[in-house]
Structures are given as C-alpha cells and as structure tokens.
C-alpha cells in the first residue's frame, strides 16, 4: 500500500505581510495528480476556499483582491488526487499592516552611534499595546518581536543593541499590535536611520552594507542580536 500523499507547499505573493487594501495571492503547490485544491483558514469554517488546479495541475491560485482584517490569519492547504486527500501543508501566516495608527520610533541616546557602544531603539504607541515589532529595511521578516509577559498593555518597547557594529546600521521601522491577533499590525512607524561610525579606539570607518539581507527564510524570524530588553516585555519568536 502506498504511503500518504506528500504535503503541498503554501506561499504568498508578493509576500505574507500585506498592507490594508493591497492585493495578495496565495499559492498552493501539490502534484501533477491533483484534481482539486482546498485552502483552510484557522478558526474559519472549512473549507475556506476551493480551486481547480491550474495547468499543469500542480498548483492552485487563491486570490485576495483587497486585504482586510478578515483575511489575516493562519492558512493551510490540501489537494485531492485520485487516491484521496493529501496531508496539510505547513501553515502560512498572513499578516495585515494598517490596522492601528503608526507608532513612533526613536533612538536613545542618539541615532548616531559609535561602533562598540550601545543604543536602544524605542517604539512608542499612542494607545496601549502588548506587542511590538522592529523591522530593518531590506530584511525579509521581523528582526525583533517583543510581547508583554501577561498581556499587560504598554505604550512602548525598548530594543537594546549592544555592542553595536556596522551591521546594525540601516533603516528601521516598528509596528505595534494587540495580542488577541498578532496577524494585525499597526501602520509602520516613520523610518529611523541608524548610523554607525568607527570606534573610538579605531579611527578607521566601519564597513557598511548598502543592502542588509535577512539571514533566514522569508517565513522565519531573524534571531536577534542584543541584550534582554529593559522594559516589561520579553522576546517572543513566532
């Protein structure tokens, strides 16, 4: 007897973090034997959607023409072949930005920092929130993700970086969110440019990267650098 059908793979275009109102396409790729594809959304009646395969039958397209809160969440897909239904895909987490007003991002003591020293990026929201994310521009996914210990609402989160190196230089933004749905994020903060200069001991300028890229897959968070935050928030990796 043949083993279980291989599970399909699930991904989003242009990616899995989508601004309110923008379009997104979810792709489910199975096998050439697929006759039908099914997309399930966590905490929604199943199936969330069904699609016939596109030629040559190894994938299906699920289109969301305008992103709203209703579409944010965790998805899995399946395909049906002549021998039955496949195992579920690994989950895809579709996140919407623009759900809340934008926070403010600042650097303490200054956005101009000497290599080897310390700097703290401070993300502040007007209303109390319990989750804060820091994104470095041109990274593919969250750099740091802070969540309060007991759902306590706070107006800010601190992202300390120590010791700072040239790799920390670049453009940052932060988001805030409520814990009841970490698939809904605020508008992004205005950008903060962190400029790292050469160390006091070494007057030579530190090398800089014009493009800082993420170290891991699109759907996995970067591991952080830096010490434990000084706020009442703790690090939390999705």
């Amino acid at each position: 007897q043949a083993g279980p059908l291989p599970k399909p793979t699930l991904w989003a275009e242009p990616g899995s973090v989508i601004s309110w109102g923008n379009s997104v396409t979810i792709w489910c790729q199975g096998t050439l034997e697929a006759r039908e594809y099914r997309l399930d959304k966590e905490e929604s009646p199943a199936p969330w959607d069904r699609q016939n395969p596109l030629e040559p039958k190894n994938k299906a397209r699920f289109s969301i023409p305008s992103m709203t809160e209703d579409y944010a969440g965790r998805y899995r897909c399946y395909y049906r072949s002549p021998v039955g239904w496949s195992q579920p895909s690994d989950p895809l987490e579709l996140v919407m930005t623009g759900a809340y007003s934008k926070p403010t991002l600042s650097a303490l003591p200054s956005p101009l920092v000497t290599s080897g020293k310390s700097v703290t990026l401070l993300c502040q929201s007007r209303s109390p929130m319990d989750t804060f994310l820091l994104i470095k521009e041109r990274a593919a996914h969250p750099l740091l993700h802070l969540r309060s210990e007991h759902g306590a609402q706070q107006h800010q989160a601190e992202f300390p970086m120590s010791p700072v190196t040239s790799v920390h230089g670049g453009t940052y933004r932060c988001f805030s969110s409520h814990g009841f749905s970490h698939y809904l994020l605020s508008h992004p903060s205005d950008p903060l440019e962190l400029i790292v200069s050469g160390s006091l001991e070494d007057p030579r300028p530190s090398p800089t990267r014009s493009v800082s890229t993420a170290a891991g897959p699109e759907d996995q968070p970067l591991m952080p650098t830096g010490s434990v935050p000084h706020s009442g928030l703790r690090r939390h990796w999705e």
Epitope: W11, P14, V17, G21, Q29, A139, V211, A214, P217, E218
Partner: antibody
Framework: QVELQQSGPGLVKPSETLSLTCTVS????????WSWTRQPPGKGLEWIGY???????NYNPSLESRVTISVDTSKNQFSLKLSSVTAADTAVYYC?????????????????WGQGTTVTVSS | DIQMTQSPSSLSASVGDRVTITCRAS??????LAWYQQKPGKVPKLLIY???TLQSGVPSRFSGSGSGTDFTLTISSLQPEDLATYYC?????????FGQGTKLEIK
Amino acid sequence: QVELQQSGPGLVKPSETLSLTCTVSGGSISTYFWSWTRQPPGKGLEWIGYTNYRGNTNYNPSLESRVTISVDTSKNQFSLKLSSVTAADTAVYYCARRGGYYGSGNYGGMDVWGQGTTVTVSS
Amino acid sequence: DIQMTQSPSSLSASVGDRVTITCRASQGISNYLAWYQQKPGKVPKLLIYAASTLQSGVPSRFSGSGSGTDFTLTISSLQPEDLATYYCQKYDSAPWTFGQGTKLEIK
C-alpha cells in the same frame, strides 16, 4: 553586498536543452524570490519565471511547458532549464533577485541582477 | 493574465526637459509595480519599486506615482546619461509581466 554570477554555455543546438546557473554570493539564497528574465536581440525584457528557497515555482505561461527553474540551497544556486530550444530562444538571459519585505509595507522590485549570458541557438 | 502597456514606445526630449512615461495594467495590481532603466548593452537597473519608492542610489530626479491600474515614471530634468530604454513590471502575482519598453532619446 549580494552579487549574482551566471554560468552556462553560450551556444545551444536546436531541439536541445538550454541550462544556466546563477550563484548567489554575499548573502543567503534562503529568502526572497529568485527569477530569470530574457531579452531577445533588439527586443524587450521577457520574464521567464521564479523560484523561492523551498523550490516553489511560477513560470511565464508562454514558456511553462518547456521551462524548469530549480534551487540548490546547499550551493546557494538556482538554475534554469529550457527544453526543445529553437532560434526564437536566442537571447541574453538574466538571473535576478526580487527584493524582500521592506518595513514601509512595500516589497521590492528586482534589485540585484546577474551579468547576463548571451545564448545563441544554432546548429 | 494581466497585460502591461507602456506609452509612448519611444520619445525624444532635450536636456533639462520634464519627461513622463506611463504604464497601464489591464487589471488592478495595487502598488506592486517597478520601473527599470536599461542603457544600451547594459544590465537592467531598478529605479522605482512599490510604484513610488526610489531605489537606493537612484537620482532624485526620477519619481514614480500611481496605484491600481495607472502608473507614471517622471524624470524632472532630463540628463544626457538618462539615454536608455525604460520598462515597467508588475510583481503582484505571477506572471511578473514587463511592459514593452519606452526608448528615450536625447535631442
């Protein structure tokens, strides 16, 4: 700084398979989308297809029956194979990276390109 | 599939002129549009992404606008080095179709 280095033959015989490889240096292939585009002599750009690090692919419908794009994360490479080539497939072939998520809420365009490989289909 | 139509296909302008190139999608693509510059014999270069965001290192005389189906690339003051062919490209969802290109010549 991420760089893309293309390799592969510049001359392919009709009905054979064109094979090109793009090696990613200065960064990991395990993020973003990695694509191939071509440009026939004196003509415009034609998108061929993409892969991501997991090997998920999408292709230009006009080429779908002949094209395969694959990824080898252990070698930081992705490859293009185009079967049953004819003179109409003579072109400069480019590999490129499509930028990832930017904190502004935007996704980038194809921001890093290979040097291009001129492929001539001729017997 | 969504078609991308650029206009004009070619144009000639003088140094210092303001130049506008348009790109129209046959269906809405949100702001998932990029503009590229390709100089003769060279590799394409990303100018604008997300319809209006200037790529790092690109001169500020280049700007982009639009959302949905209608997009514009503007060069505020044409320079001799801007001689090139310009392409738009959608990247909302595969296929990532290019426009047919606009060849810009300097008078």
